[in-house]
Amino acid sequence: QLSLPSILPNENEKVVQLNSSFSLRCFGESEVSWQYPMSEEESSDVEIRNEENNSGLFVTVLEVSSASAAHTGLYTCYYNHTQTEENELEGRHIYIYVPDPDVAFVPLGMTDYLVIVEDDDSAIIPCRTTDPETPVTLHNSEGVVPASYDSRQGFNGTFTVGPYICEATVKGKKFQTIPFNVYALKATSELDLEMEALKTVYKSGETIVVTCAVFNNEVVDLQWTYPGEVKGKGITMLEEIKVPSIKLVYTLTVPEATVKDSGDYECAARQATREVKEMKKVTISVHEKGFIEIKPTFSQLEAVNLHEVKHFVVEVRAYPPPRISWLKNNLTLIENLTEITTDVEKIQEIRYRSKLKLIRAKEEDSGHYTIVAQNEDAVKSYTFELLTQVPSSILDLVDDHHGSTGGQTVRCTAEGTPLPDIEWMICKDIKKCNNETSWTILANNVSNIITEIHSRDRSTVEGRVTFAKVEETIAVRCLAKNLLGAENRELKLVAPTLRSELTVA
């Protein structure tokens, strides 16, 4: 840590005679520079040079050959490496006065006559005298304004909006400044910053637009940081809205975006007069071309129970916005002819949700359903098969006897989805068939009895059982069952000998 440079003469302030010469020496442990009141254009009679000495210190001399009122002000000696744009200069100061009977006030630039005040904050009206002994008064349209005066700075106080004039008398001669205009700016202690990107997803060639709005604040500096900045891409705009309240709208426009323009877009607002900073960020993605992704929330084979209400939901990610349609067996779904409805809902900027709704499922609703999403750059589809599940029911139970051989076949026709299983049961003691315990399942491996099953179509099945010889009356039961239910029917098989006796009778 270097100690502050030192100045010779070692004084806080010094009064220098008009037109005389003066020099200020600065000593430091590292390279030092001078900051002085005048701009470079005005400083033709200010000479700065480095001086060698044996102390091991760096010495820089500021010399003025002919002092004038314009040389009045603060001279600061500082280490070169410590100067930053943001911070006030750290160094050693000396204030020089050059009294001039014809110039009571230090000459100022035009911008110095505009005094910006934040709300009810104090401000400085910078009329500085060339002579520290000169009495000064401040006036506005109402008369003398009470305010504290410092010849190094000017009048300090809380001022209302309007023009102010500084007045001084030097050796009986009255001097007046041109009016200082106090202008009030709206500024809050906190920054209310809002960022808006109507879109965050683009494709190549489109124009990115991001806005940041600052509310109730006029003293704002806003900087954009974004990927295209390094290529000098992007055009800014500032719009000031005064009604119903103050709003500064900053817009960044990036025409003809490319994939390289993807990334974080950040606006950082800083209050020009206070160390108040606020940042907002949005992530923008630019795609080479449009895209579509389909994400179903169900499988490629789905089942619905008869009369059930069921929804099939498909998530779609797409840009640009897609057209979404549904097909059944490759034909467009005509909703008003069926109890099937579809809808599309936008969930987020590029996320959509499409629903296929079955209101009361019917057998004819079974089939292949396809969702198709398309935009100008892509087409995607997803197909699933829907089965309407119908409880099994027996359509027919008949017997068929084989004449003289005494054999008999029983046929049981059943329908349902999924296709029913058929089981056979037999009751040999006809008098006890009311009792469930009298029924036994007919096994496939029983001799003289053959069971077989044939699918007639997608939802109809026929089961057959053939008895080689029926010697006594038995009862046969067909049991058709699937996931949704079971149904059974019974049939009596009479032995051929008994049948002939009955016939004679």
């Epitope: 489109e206 000098g232 800014t236 705009m237 025409p255 003809e256």
Partner: antibody, heavy 121, light 107 residues
């Protein structure tokens, strides 16, 4: 050959309307932002309006905001400027100009020959 | 809005002369500046973009320099076809603004 050709200018009374057209050829029109720039007789250039390639973004100079509307038809390679409530100070040669991004800058690299609009009673 | 000023407003010179036109922006615009040439009765023509880059097809006697707020267009050796009005334009911020122009005339 890359070319812009304006049409639709003429004499119109204050308060009247006019629609300017600009036909583009020789480049992929939809890939570029387009602009209208005007020049009053004996005066400098004044930017009037901007439209992005896909017509999603439009900007206007304060002097024409609310009165002029910029539009484009990429299928027809055409740019338009609908001018309503015309004033004497709108009298100028109107140029359509292509905005191009170069590294570290934007510039109007292609200009039309201009069309004269005279607002007078 | 960013104001653009140009100096001189006009200059009378001869073929073969070196001509320098300056353009100043009311606030820093980095190198987002273009220069245009406009001959009487014609549309403007882009000469320089990004403050110092020569547009293709433009003779190398034209050059641009500067950054921030102060920019210069130089014509190293004036040719008869260079007698025209020259405009600078900032392209960093809407509304795009042009300088008032500098007329280069024959002495």
């Amino acid at each position: 050959e890359v070319q812009l050709v304006e049409s639709g200018g003429g004499l119109v009374q204050p308060g009247g309307s006019l629609r300017l057209s600009c036909a583009a050829s020789g480049f992929t029109f939809s890939s570029y932002s387009m602009n209208w720039v005007r020049q009053a007789p004996g005066k400098g250039l004044e930017w009037v309006s901007y439209i992005s390639g896909s017509s999603t973004t439009m900007y206007y100079a304060d002097s024409v905001k609310g009165r002029f509307t910029i539009s484009r038809d990429n299928a027809k390679n055409s740019l338009y400027l609908q001018m309503n409530s015309l004033r004497d100070e709108d009298t100028a040669v109107y140029y359509c100009a292509r905005l191009r991004h170069f590294d570290w800058s934007y510039a109007f690299d292609i200009w039309g020959q201009g069309t004269m609009v005279t607002v007078s009673s | 809005d960013i104001q653009m000023t140009q100096s001189p407003s006009s200059v009378s010179t001869s073929v073969g002369d070196r001509v320098t036109i300056t353009c100043r922006a009311s606030q820093g615009i980095s190198s987002w500046l273009a220069w245009y040439q406009q001959r009487p009765g014609k549309a403007p023509k882009l000469l320089i973009y990004a403050a110092s880059s020569l547009q293709s097809g433009v003779p190398s006697r034209f050059s641009g320099s500067g950054s921030g707020t102060d920019f210069t267009l130089t014509i190293s050796s004036l040719q008869p076809e260079d007698f025209a009005t020259y405009f600078c334009q900032q392209a960093t911020s809407f509304p795009f603004t042009f300088g008032p122009g500098t007329k280069v005339g024959i002495k």
